[in-house]
């Protein structure tokens, strides 16, 4: 058993049929010695008396809020949560496996630049009695500070018969050094509590590996005289690191119709303009990627050919 | 060329060669993103590698103030990786595929380090650690880790030279 926060404790249980469970001793936080009784949740049934209560925790019915009283007055609470371990593996029932970029990916994180700011998100089908707490650091043995905000519900989607909820959190490295080569990864730890179930999820990454620039901005077209060609120009996204002579992007420019199966024109460039062939009912799209490190491409920025 | 005395390097040449190094480092190990090598005790095996750190003056302001600190650090790293790529970690079993770009990568590391430090001038270089794994599978894992680390190192070097070529060239 360990303390998650004040008056909230996590009991780690090997979860299998007829498991013996864990013996837990609860102590009432009071100077009083006599006349103390214990109850669980809303029940008025007295579970025991005395300053300590010894219980055998085997299942979710044994978890919950234990309260010690004296003469009708509440003295203190202890909330017991269960963390299940099945076949040596901690349960991951609360969050959905996003399976990208690999199986058992519960947390996904992205950064728009090298400033040390990043966003992580996760998915669940659970709608109520759900809380998250996020901690982060740079490195684990001698951790350096990363500050995370509160996790918030950022999107709701309908997936077949189920509703899916996306939560996200923003974090900022306290002393970020955008130009340095990272040697220790960022660690992100998410505590998830659903009713009386506790789970924790972790992710470890370098900012450079989760970079995904915003799409290029201000796409403009200029038809070339006596030609089918069009000069397309754009600018670096506002959120990208500066100066651009140091933090450079490379771009992919594509002309394509509405269907992915249609023919296309495509060219890669390090410049912020390119000449392409525009077709009726097609769109010109541009996306960006770090020029020197192959992290994710941005989403496309598009303008119609006409 | 970046001479210890403090003259300027051939920024544009260094830019071109460092960008080539980036391309080669990714072709040598393109599936980097699909392997989470940090789970394999990454900190013990590659923490001896010279990283370009915050105080090394490789940020735009540091380069403007005095690029020599940064260039020395980059040179140190290039020599270090050049030695690693020539060591039995890469020459031993399992043999590299004949079309592996590691050979080109090795030659380009040497080429850039020579651009930075001509014959007869010597910056101190970092001692190469004795990473000599006994098992072929350990060697394979170490190769991946070294190439992954090299990708990060050459990316920073390429940014330095691109910025230098754009803003510090005579």
């Amino acid at each position: 058993i360990w303390e998650l926060k004040k008056d909230v404790y996590v009991v780690e249980l090997d979860w299998y049929p007829d498991a013996p469970g864990e013996m837990v001793v609860l102590t009432c936080d009071t100077p009083e010695e006599d006349g103390i009784t214990w109850t669980l949740d809303q029940s008025s049934e007295v579970l025991g008396s005395g300053k300590t209560l010894t219980i055998q925790v085997k299942e979710f019915g044994d978890a919950g809020q234990y309260t010690c009283h004296k003469g009708g007055e509440v003295l203190s609470h202890s909330l017991l949560l269960l963390h299940k371990k099945e076949d040596g593996i901690w349960s991951t029932d609360i969050l959905k496996d996003q399976k990208e970029p690999k199986n058992k990916t519960f947390l996904r994180c992205e950064a728009k630049n090298y400033s040390g700011r990043f966003t992580c998100w996760w998915l669940t089908t659970i709608s109520t009695d759900l809380t998250f707490s996020v901690k982060s650091s740079r490195g684990s043995s001698d951790p350096q500070g990363v500050t995370c905000g509160a996790a918030t519900l950022s999107a709701e989607r309908v997936r077949g018969d189920n509703k899916e909820y996306e939560y996200s959190v923003e974090c900022q490295e306290d002393s970020a050094c955008p130009a340095a080569e990272e040697s220790l990864p960022i660690e992100v730890m998410v505590d998830a509590v659903h009713k009386l179930k506790y789970e924790n999820y972790t992710s470890s990454f370098f900012i450079r590996d989760i970079i995904k620039p915003d799409p290029p901005k201000n796409l403009q077209l200029k038809p070339l005289k006596n030609s089918r060609q069009v000069e397309v120009s754009w600018e670096y996204p506002d959120t990208w690191s500066t100066p651009h002579s140091y933090f450079s992007l490379t771009f992919c420019v594509q002309v394509q119709g509405k269907s992915k199966r249609e023919k296309k024109d495509r060219v890669f460039t390090d410049k912020t303009s390119a000449t392409v062939i525009c077709r009726k009912n097609a769109s010109i799209s541009v996306r960006a990627q770090d020029r020197y490190y192959s992290s994710s491409w941005s989403e496309w920025a598009s303008v119609p050919c006409s | 060329r970046a001479v210890p005395g403090g003259s300027s390097p051939a920024w544009t040449q260094c830019q071109q060669l460092s960008q080539k190094l980036c391309t080669l480092a990714w072709s040598a190990h393109p599936l980097v993103g699909h392997m989470d090598l940090r789970e394999e005790g990454d900190e013990e095996t590659t923490n001896d590698v010279p990283h370009i750190q915050c105080g090394d003056g490789c940020d735009p302001q540091g380069l403007r103030d005095n690029s020599q600190f940064c260039l020395q650090r980059i040179h140190q790293g290039l020599i270090f990786y050049e030695k690693l790529l020539g060591s039995d970690i890469f020459t031993g079993e399992p043999s590299l595929l004949p079309d592996s770009p590691v050979g080109q990568l090795h030659a380009s590391l040497l080429g850039l380090s020579q651009l930075l430090q001509p014959e007869g001038h010597h910056w101190e270089t970092q001692q190469i650690p004795s990473l000599s794994p006994s098992q072929p599978w350990q060697r394979l894992l170490l190769r991946f880790k070294i190439l992954r680390s090299l990708q990060a190192f050459v990316a920073v070097a390429a940014r330095v030279f691109a910025h230098g070529a754009a803003t510090l060239s005579p």
Epitope: R228, E262, K263, V267, F268, T275, I277 | -
Partner: antibody, heavy 118, light 107 residues
Framework: QVQLVQSGAEVKKPGASVKVSCKAS????????LHWVRQAPGQGLEWMGW????????EHAPKFQGRVTMTTDTSTSTAYMELRSLRSDDTAVYYC???????????WGQGTMVTVSS | EIVMTQSPATLSVSPGERATLSCRAS??????LHWYQQKPGQAPRLLIY???QSISGIPARFSGSGSGTEFTLTISSLQSEDFAVYYC?????????FGGGTKVEIK
């Protein structure tokens, strides 16, 4: 499968014109760009231009501007390349090539030998 | 127009050996570079597109690398059917241009 079949060899006099055909099969004709590339005997490849069979748009290499006409007949899935004012240095194998991507060549015809000789 | 230069013009290699072919552009072309193989009396065949992207059906011994102005086609272990002429082609800007070719012959 995607296939391009070209017309047979031609012998022409200097100053004459030649029209080479390229019949496509195995795909929807308007779904691919069509290019013409030539190769003089013992020489390398030279791009001449492209046509979009969907709308008839064309773009030629400056070298052939005014001397080449590229057309298509969607009813027969056939592309044509006419080269006028032939000179002896136009002697070459003329290839049609196609791709969904505009700027490189995925599928090639077998080539048509055009000899220009007086 | 962009001039593409291939070297060497002829490469003599023994079967089973590795062949490295070079292609240089007269200006930076990012990764807008494609490789073709041509055997005598046949049309060219696309091997690699956008500098390093492999084509399904092309043996894995063919690989491409490079960006900017310098590109390489590597044939890891030459088979008898690989003796041919290889061309690079830039697609950075029109007119599209080819290199002069590298003939890979049996040593």
């Amino acid at each position: 499968q995607v296939q391009l079949v070209q017309s047979g060899a031609e012998v022409k006099k200097p100053g004459a014109s030649v029209k080479v055909s390229c019949k496509a099969s195995g795909y929807t004709f308007t779904d691919y760009y069509l290019h013409w590339v030539r190769q003089a005997p013992g020489q390398g490849l030279e791009w001449m231009g492209w046509i979009d069979p969907e709308n008839g748009d064309t773009e030629h290499a400056p070298k052939f501007q005014g001397r080449v006409t590229m057309t298509t007949d969607t009813s027969t899935s056939t592309a044509y390349m006419e080269l006028r004012s032939l000179r002896s240095d136009d002697t070459a194998v003329y290839y049609c090539a196609a791709n969904k991507e505009l700027r490189y060549f995925d599928v090639w015809g077998q080539g048509t030998m055009v000899t220009v000789s007086s | 127009e962009i001039v593409m230069t291939q070297s060497p013009a002829t490469l003599s290699v023994s079967p089973g050996e590795r062949a490295t072919l070079s292609c240089r552009a007269s200006q930076s072309i990012s990764i807008n570079l494609h490789w073709y193989q041509q055997k005598p009396g046949q049309a060219p065949r696309l091997l690699i597109y956008f500098a390093s992207q492999s084509i399904s059906g092309i043996p894995a011994r063919f690989s491409g690398s490079g960006s900017g102005t310098e590109f390489t086609l590597t044939i890891s272990s030459l088979q008898s059917e690989d003796f041919a002429v290889y061309y690079c082609q830039q697609s950075n800007s029109f007119p599209l241009t080819f290199g002069g070719g590298t003939k890979v012959e049996i040593k």
